[in-house]
């Protein structure tokens, strides 16, 4: 005989996580980012939607604009001008591409109360921004840029050539939006607003993706997109200042290319001003292991741009492409010149270097086996900035802060010791002069937002610790979280295990791989997360494991330039390589094992299905690239080289998903793409598909119409809810 | 140029209301936005109220709807009626000028000063 078990009422009432908590959003949390306007001045938009003024030293706040104000116009966002004048407000939001969107701006004079009424800007607008002091206004309509001196002046027209799908003034086409810059605007104001340098992208020879969007008419809508796939011709790039101050006098001037990237296709990285009459460029060569930045000075007497060659600063992997995913970003420091900037050491670390005249004499600021990841703030005496270096963890990120005052220079890690089981991986945002900082954690434990003195680093006060949340999750049994490596042939794999709540490791489970597996990406980072894999582990049983292989970020050279001009090869391996060491582990069921990825996860775990292992069961490709000659050139390019027969186009061939189409005989697939994806063309999927049926190979479909690679809305529910009966059926679990 | 001078603090009971005024000497008063700033002992001097030269006014949080600041431009001055007075309204009530917007909330924004008057009110 057993003794009956104790009867714990606390434990009686947890419950597992359901399905329907996730599509509702249940269990998400809140983050604090100040919209910082002075050194210890920020705002914030109140739950009830009033515009709020916060001033950190007296305590004190001031609401600015009403709710009421919001409303009258279904304003969702606002912006304050540098000279607290005016404020514009943005309603009628219609999303276009990841960060593109169009909206109708009003402008309100805070001095009457009143709307700025007469010369009131057209709609709908592309973009629109202040300029760094006063109340100049620029923004981008029908591909134009216009200046206004002041909201209700007249628009002064800087650009005529602006046509849709043609000619990008201010503005990203898709590619650089998506890809280089990565924002929805493409202007740049000097910091005190005397200039403003804009980028001009000619996409007339771009060939384009038309789609069909099928709406509710009659006849479907065709999306036409200049889109250049991987190979084809390339958006044309330059880069204009104009004076705003006379924009008549001499127009539109334009920056010179340095030669040695003129010489043949390149790209435009990224623009930072230095001072009023000093601005840094970055340029790229098409095939992106070399990029120049150069620092252009303005030349009063002929009113030029100067960029002299003993100003240019070249960068260049020979291992690899430059850069991480994307080529860094040099913060200068106050001398206007030197500059502090990301980029490999000779151990193959990513590191933060100090550049006073030469690349090859910069001083190296950040050192060791792990990785520099951002540079946050420099001021007079201190450097900011995020790595993954506290106790070998690659998947956390702690801000450090580095007196650059002193020499030797001092580091202190601001955040490590903070709240150390709840906050692991941080960013942080600061004011004006680093006076005052917030401090964002997201987890491993429920994020909690706080506001520090940029001084002593003392916490002020906590702006959100999501309070409800944490009470919401008292009575819910999440599943358990594991980080871990494994030390495979002189590769480190990080994997994250997410168990269910009562995981015994005498029992066996169900095994679900969620890949992605992109070059430069992370899937094991100390974060909070309640999705629908935490769904799974809680109420379905299973174990989830996410696994960094060959080509991901954070963990040195070797690791992320592997996959270097061979994607499709070792991102798969180390999938599979990782299930093999979970299945010795014990606990794991190996009739029941599945993966699913979305995007390059989709290609990943299509590739992982079929490689011939035998290993998987069944498994989900969302939204999946099939062959790399479908996608954006300025992506593949930077991993694969170009699709010619005297560059990489072999393996071109030999990575696509359609060439194993024989190899899915023996799992069950699920695909699924949406119809209106501008990103993976559902291209992707449809040869997959043809491959397949080719093949008479059988599997499943789902399709999602008028939908993009996000599959946002109430397909959400329906993509969750479908991919939980396919794993469900496959692992022979009740419904 | 604009010169500023204070009156009508004292000393007043809980619950209990005042009147401070700030006259200004110069012909552009219209043009200046108006503040009144209070610095308690041993506390940073904090925006209590402050009305912008289009009449648009501006409130801290804790005196929304006790306080009201008003301007006469033709008198060249700037009032702030206070009700339902607290002790922990208890300060010296500085009266400051700028051109410009007023809804700037540090005292080093504000370039012309009154030199104060004490208000004290109590329990």
């Known amino acids: 005989l057993r003794p009956s078990r104790v009867h714990n009422s606390e434990e009686n009432t947890m419950r597992a996580l359901t399905l329907k908590d996730i599509l509702n959003g249940t269990f998400s949390y809140k983050t604090f980012f100040p919209n910082w306007i002075s050194g210890q001045e920020y705002l914030h938009q109140s739950a009830d939607n009033n515009i709020v003024l916060y001033n950190i030293e007296t305590g004190q706040s001031y609401t600015i604009l009403s709710n009421r104000t919001m409303k009258s116009v279904n304003a969702s966002n606002y912006g304050l001008s540098p000279d607290r004048q005016f404020v514009y407000l943005e309603s009628d939001y219609s999303k276009l591409w990841r960060y593109s969107y169009t909206a109708t701006y009003y402008i309100y004079d805070l001095s009457n109360g009143e709307f700025v009424r007469g010369n009131e800007l057209p709609r709908p607008i592309q973009y629109l921004c202040w300029s760094p002091v006063g109340s100049k206004l620029a923004y981008v309509y029908q591909n134009n840029i216009y200046l206004k001196q002041r909201p209700g002046d007249p628009p002064f027209q800087i650009t005529f050539n602006g046509r849709e799908n043609k000619i990008f003034n201010g503005i990203p086409d898709w590619v650089y939006e998506e890809e280089m810059l990565p924002t929805k605007y493409a202007l740049w104001w000097s910091p005190n607003g005397k200039f403003l340098a804009y980028a001009e992208f000619n996409d007339k020879d771009i060939p384009v993706i038309a789609y069909s969007y099928y709406g509710d008419e009659q006849y479907p809508r065709t999306i036409n997109i200049p889109y250049p796939k991987a190979g084809a011709k390339n958006p044309v790039v330059r880069i204009f200042i104009i004076d705003t101050t006379y924009p008549a006098y001499v127009g539109p001037q334009e920056v010179p290319v340095p030669a040695m990237i003129a010489s043949s296709d390149y790209y435009f990285s990224w623009l930072t001003w230095v001072t009023d009459e000093r601005v840094c460029l970055q340029w790229l060569k098409r095939v992106q292991n070399v990029s120049v930045l150069s620092i252009c000075d303005f030349r009063e007497d002929w009113q030029t741009w100067d960029c002299p060659k003993t100003q240019e600063h070249i960068e260049e992997s020979r291992t690899g492409w430059a850069g991480g995913f994307f080529v860094s970003r040099p913060v200068f420091s106050y001398d206007a010149i030197s500059y502090y900037k990301i980029f490999s050491d000779k151990d193959g670390y990513k590191h933060i270097h100090y550049i006073k005249d030469t690349v090859e004499n910069a001083i190296q600021i950040t050192s060791g086996k792990w990785e520099a990841i951002n540079i946050f703030r420099v001021t007079q005496d201190s450097l900011f900035y995020s790595s993954n270096e506290f106790e070998e963890y690659p998947g956390r990120r702690n801000i450090y802060r580095i007196s650059i005052g002193s020499y030797p220079p001092s580091k202190k890690c601001v955040t490590c010791h903070l709240r150390k089981e709840r906050c692991q991986y941080y960013t942080a945002s600061f004011s004006d002069y680093a006076k005052y900082y917030a401090l964002v954690c997201y987890g491993p434990g429920i994020p909690i937002s706080t506001l520090h003195d940029g001084r002593t680093d003392q916490e002020i006060k906590i702006l959100e610790e999501n309070k409800e949340l944490e009470n919401a999750l008292k009575n819910i049994q999440l599943p358990k979280e594991e980080i871990k490596k494994l030390e495979v042939d002189e590769i480190t794999l990080w994997y994250k295990m997410i168990l269910p709540p009562q995981f015994d490791r005498s029992k066996k489970y169900p095994l679900l791989i969620q890949v992605y597996g992109g070059p430069c990406s992370q899937s094991v980072r100390s974060v909070f997360a309640v999705n629908w894999i935490s769904y799974l582990a809680s109420k379905e049983g299973m174990v989830i494991a996410l696994v960094d292989g060959r080509g991901t970020a954070f963990q040195g050279d070797k690791l992320l330039y592997a996959v270097y001009r061979k994607l499709g090869v070792y991102e798969v391996e180390d999938q599979i390589t990782a299930v093999r060491k979970f299945i010795e582990m014990g606990f794991i069921d190996e009739k029941r094992i599945a993966i699913w990825g979305w995007s390059y996860g989709g290609y990943v775990s299509s590739l992982a299905l079929a490689s011939g292992t035998g290993l998987f069961k069944c498994g989900i490709a969302v939204a999946p690239v099939s062959s790399w000659e479908y996608y954006a050139s300025v992506y593949t390019e930077r991993f694969m080289g170009l699709p010619t027969k005297d560059d990489n186009l072999e393996h071109y061939k030999n990575s696509t998903v359609m060439a194993r189409a024989e190899y899915f005989r023996n799992v069950d697939y699920l695909l699924i793409h949406g119809t209106a994806d501008d990103n993976v063309h559902f291209q992707n999927s449809a040869q997959i598909a043809k491959a397949l049926v080719n093949a008479q190979v059988d599997f499943q479909a789902m399709w999602y119409s008028d939908q993009n690679h996000g599959l946002s809305g109430l397909s959400t529910n329906h993509l969750y809810t479908h991919m939980t009966h396919f794993l469900k059926q496959c692992f022979s679990l009740s419904d | 140029q604009v010169q500023l001078q204070e009156s009508g603090g004292g000393l007043v009971e809980a619950e209990g209301s005042l009147r401070l005024s700030c006259a200004a000497s110069?012909?552009?008063?219209?043009?200046?936005?108006m503040g009144w700033f209070r610095q308690a002992a041993g506390k940073e001097r904090e925006l209590v109220a402050a009305?912008?030269?289009?009449?648009?006014?501006l409130y801290a949080d804790n005196v929304k709807g006790r306080f009201t600041i008003s301007r006469d431009n033709a008198r060249n001055t700037v009032y702030l009626l206070s009700n339902s007075l607290k002790p922990e309204d208890t300060a010296v009530y500085y009266c400051a000028a700028r051109r410009g917007s007023a809804y700037y909330t540090n005292h080093i924004d504000w370039p012309y000063w009154g030199q104060g008057t004490q208000v004290t009110v109590s329990s």
């Open positions: 009305i912008s030269a289009g009449g648009s006014t």
């Open positions: 110069g012909r552009t008063f219209g043009s200046y936005a």
